[in-house]
Interface confidence: medium
């Protein structure tokens, strides 16, 4: 989060998170401004000359939807300024001279989570936005799965799922005969120290995906040849 001191007596704290594609969502904590004031944040690109994007605050939130040709890349950075009208004059204050979207990432949740049951295991697959495909190897997932009647707090978790959009759950991990639910979330992977700065992302987990329901496969017993063991 970034703090803008502004020109008024009270400081404001803005938190702006990006889905790393075309959207930046901002939230601010500040007392309401006076009646008739329509505050906004202005994102001015430090990389694309002339690139400015207005984020009109409604209550304590605003969203910028970038045009397709402005899809975010790691080198993007913006100057954020806060604008509001007071006594008929526009007041401007600096919020962040170098806002790096890649340092404030909250991805959209994975979509189209599906299950495919076959003997002895369940294959889960999911989709990511085409705009994130160049970053597939930088995406890290966490899976939660449980019996349908259980609360999510009781779910088992599997994490450190990096760079893939599929996963196998073996039958022994599930309770045979029960319907199970699984859900997934994603974040930018934390990479090794030798990664160039421009490839280094930080942020938080996405919201959880829509869950998928599936019947647990039967566990396979040991294969016994027809003539039996010696």
């Amino acid at each position: 989060s970034v703090t803008g001191e502004g020109q008024g007596p009270r400081s404001r704290t803005f938190t702006c998170l990006t889905n790393n594609i075309l959207r930046i969502d901002c939230h601010w904590s500040a007392p309401e401004l006076g009646q008739g004031s329509s505050p906004w944040l202005l994102f001015t690109s430090n990389q694309a000359p002339g690139g400015t994007h207005k984020c009109i605050l409604r209550g304590s939130e605003c969203t910028v939807v970038l045009p397709p040709e402005a899809v975010l890349v790691p080198s993007d950075n913006f100057t954020i300024t806060f604008h509001h009208c007071m006594s008929g004059r526009e007041q401007v204050s600096l919020v962040d001279p170098e806002y790096l979207p890649r340092r404030h990432v909250k991805l959209d949740p994975p979509s189209d989570l599906q299950s495919n049951i076959s003997s002895g295991h369940c294959i889960l697959t999911w989709s990511i936005s085409p705009a994130l495909e160049p970053m597939t190897t930088l995406l890290s997932y966490e899976l939660a799965f449980k019996k349908q009647e259980e609360a999510w707090e009781q779910a088992q978790h599997r994490d450190h799922i990096v760079g893939v959009t599929w996963l196998i759950l073996e039958a022994f991990e599930l309770d045979p005969g029960f319907i199970h639910e699984a859900r997934l979330r994603v974040q930018m992977a934390t990479l090794e120290d030798d990664v160039v700065e421009e490839e280094r992302y930080t942020g938080q987990w996405s919201e959880w995906s829509q869950p998928v329901c599936f019947q647990a496969p039967q566990r396979q017993g040991p294969l016994i040849p027809p003539w039996g063991w010696p």
């Epitope: 690109s45 694309a48 000359p49 002339g50 690139g51 397709p68 040709e69 402005a70 890349v73 970053m135």
Partner: nanobody
Framework: QVQLVESGGGLVQAGGSLRLSCAAS????????MGWFRQAPGKEREFVAA????????YYADSVKGRFTISRDNAKNTVYLQMNSLKPEDTAVYYC??????????????????WGQGTQVTVSS
């Protein structure tokens, strides 16, 4: 970071054709508008052609319209300039450039952040 390397230049007779290529490194090529510029000896660098990030829009200088065609292959991280009906006045060093030009015009040089080293095109009469 985007690195650009041009190739395909050379010596050609008037009326002939050349195809320039510009290979880009980096996984974010798909997000950049691409342009070709040229600089003849003793002259300013000038805009030749440009193509939007997804190939949906193309732009040409009047002097090359109908003769040159710009295209891109995002899967190969490459932009091309097909030059037909070449004239001696097309002789120049041709530069490839990449930029986020969603607010300024694609013909403006300051729109472009990354530049290649250039490839020489010589058209003899």
């Amino acid at each position: 970071q985007v690195q650009l390397v041009e190739s395909g230049g050379g010596l050609v007779q008037a009326g002939g054709s050349l195809r320039l290529s510009c290979a880009a490194s980096g996984r974010y090529f798909y997000a950049y508008g691409m342009g070709w510029f040229r600089q003849a000896p003793g002259k300013e660098r000038e805009f030749v052609a440009a193509i939007s990030y997804n190939g949906g829009s193309t732009y040409y200088a009047d002097s090359v319209k109908g003769r040159f065609t710009i295209s891109r292959d995002n899967a190969k991280n490459t932009v091309y300039l097909q030059m037909n009906s070449l004239k001696p006045e097309d002789t120049a060093v041709y530069y490839c450039a990449a930029g986020r030009w969603y607010k300024l015009g694609p013909s403006e040089q300051r729109t472009y952040r990354y530049w290649g080293q250039g490839t020489q095109v010589t058209v003899s009469s």
